[in-house]
């Protein structure tokens, strides 16, 4: 197809050689077409499009991406030729940085359903350069963490060394959707919730005497829990005595709740106390039975093939530990009567 009618956008990706980072291109179809297509509509219902809207499907994956080879060869289908580039709905994700990503990328609807749709395409000229500005040593990371329940902020990596006063107007997107109220180089979050997690894109315009282009950076934001200040607690056994039948097999379960730690080295073990002696028991591997953002619940069982008279004189102790401290719970076996 003829790409001369495509609208054109120039983008710059300046990547840090120190960190892994991703990049995205949105299929920014001209506004009226986009309203029926990529659901990135910014028209109010009262605004009438200047020409007929694109009559395409509402299926968000219904766009086709191509790369235009610099030697003038025919357009190449992205999906077939570039394994490090992923199409997700209307967005093209670049998984690895590198100057070899520089080039012209074209997107258009797969289904052309009206004569107006022929020019329904966008050509994005992407220039990729390694960051050379050594004066900005502490630029914001492309992976930023927000602590749940606290105040936080998301900084635009390409502008993080500039003061708010110097900063140009920034356009922010979250998971591909425009955040229309955010215009500064930093998004301030008054209280962090899970839903603040996602892929943020910040764009600003840079110009010289000849042309202007969009400088874009992508930030992966994670919401995290602060490291626990508590030692683990034992959820089971609760009682310190357990009624048993002599000669029968017995399994005693120890379940403990460990709070989140970035460096997580939980200890959960059983040992036996018999008068003055104490020894650790070889028991089956510990296993996590529940995993949430805040807690990991880990279980470890002690298995007795046959309860003996001697076992009634012993104490079975579950010991759990994290970096903060340890907790124990002991169980004394008692013979069931009658």
């Amino acid at each position: 197809f003829n790409i001369s009618g495509c609208s054109t956008k120039k983008l710059l990706w300046t990547y840090s050689t120190r960190s892994e980072e991703e990049f995205v291109l949105f299929c920014d179809l001209p506004e009226p077409q986009k309203s029926h297509f990529c659901h990135r509509n910014r028209l109010s219902p009262k605004q009438v499009p200047e020409h007929l809207p694109f009559m395409g499907s509402n299926d968000l994956s219904d766009v086709q991406w191509y790369q235009q080879p610099s030697n003038g060869d025919p357009l190449e289908d992205i999906r077939k030729s570039y394994p490090h580039i992923i199409q997700d709905k209307c967005t093209l994700h670049f998984l690895t940085p590198g100057v070899n990503n520089s080039g012209s990328y074209i997107c258009r609807p797969k289904m052309i359903k009206s004569p107006y749709d022929v020019a329904c395409c966008v050509k994005m000229i992407l220039e990729v350069k390694p960051q050379t500005n050594a004066s900005c040593e502490y630029s914001a990371s492309h992976k930023q963490d927000l602590l749940l329940g606290s105040t936080g902020s998301i900084s635009c990596p390409s502008l993080s060394c500039q003061s708010d006063a110097q900063s140009p107007a920034v356009t922010w997107y979250k998971n591909g959707k425009l955040l229309s109220v955010e215009r500064s180089n930093r998004i301030v979050v008054d209280e962090v919730y899970d839903y603040h997690q996602g892929t943020y894109v910040c764009d600003y315009t840079q110009s010289d005497t000849v042309s202007s282009w969009t400088v874009r950076a992508v930030v992966q934001v994670r919401t995290i829990v602060g490291d626990t200040k508590l030692k683990p607690d034992i959820l089971d056994p609760v009682e310190d005595t357990l009624e048993v039948e002599l000669g029968k097999p017995l399994t005693i379960s120890c379940k403990a709740r460990f709070g989140f730690e970035r460096v997580f080295n939980p200890v959960i073990k059983w040992y036996i106390k018999d008068s003055d002696l104490e020894w650790e028991v070889s028991v089956p591997e510990a296993k996590s039975i529940k995993s949430t953002l805040k807690d990991e619940i880990i279980e470890r069982n002690i298995i007795l093939e046959k309860v003996t008279q001697r076992d009634l004189r012993r104490k079975f102790v579950c010991f759990v530990q994290n970096s903060i401290g340890n907790t124990t719970q002991s169980v004394q076996l008692k013979e069931k009567r009658g």
Epitope: V225, F264, P266, E285, A286, K287, S288, I289, S291, E296
Partner: nanobody, 115 residues
């Protein structure tokens, strides 16, 4: 730190079999859910199969009856036995362990099904 190392990928003809292994280190307990994911060129990563600490399993519809996930707790290893492979199974296969509901990934192993 959690480390996951996949192996066993390679080139195989349609109808053939492969067995992928994922060795976990830096974990002192059996993870709640271990999974195999795959990513074909130009496509998002998708779940292939997962196994819980209680050994219950879950499979993507496209691999049911052909793939089997299992774990060797003594060796902290999870396996994916892939039979009757098809060209559409071609992808990079990744091992995944969820701890504190967060994903930990291996580097991946390439599986190519082609005649």
């Amino acid at each position: 730190d959690v480390q996951l190392q996949e192996s066993g990928g390679g080139l195989v003809q349609p109808g053939g079999s492969l067995r992928l292994s994922c060795a976990a280190s830096g974990i002192s307990f059996r993870v709640n859910v271990l999974g195999w994911y795959r990513q074909a060129p130009g496509k998002p990563r998708e779940l292939v199969a997962s196994i819980s600490s209680g050994d219950s399993t879950n499979y993507a519809d496209s691999v049911k009856g052909r793939f089997t996930i299992s774990r060797d707790n003594a060796k902290s290893t999870v396996y994916l036995q892939m039979n009757n492979l098809k060209p559409e199974d071609t992808a990079v296969y990744y091992c995944n362990a969820r701890i504190f509901a967060r994903d930990n990934w291996g580097q991946g192993t390439q599986v190519t099904v082609s005649s």
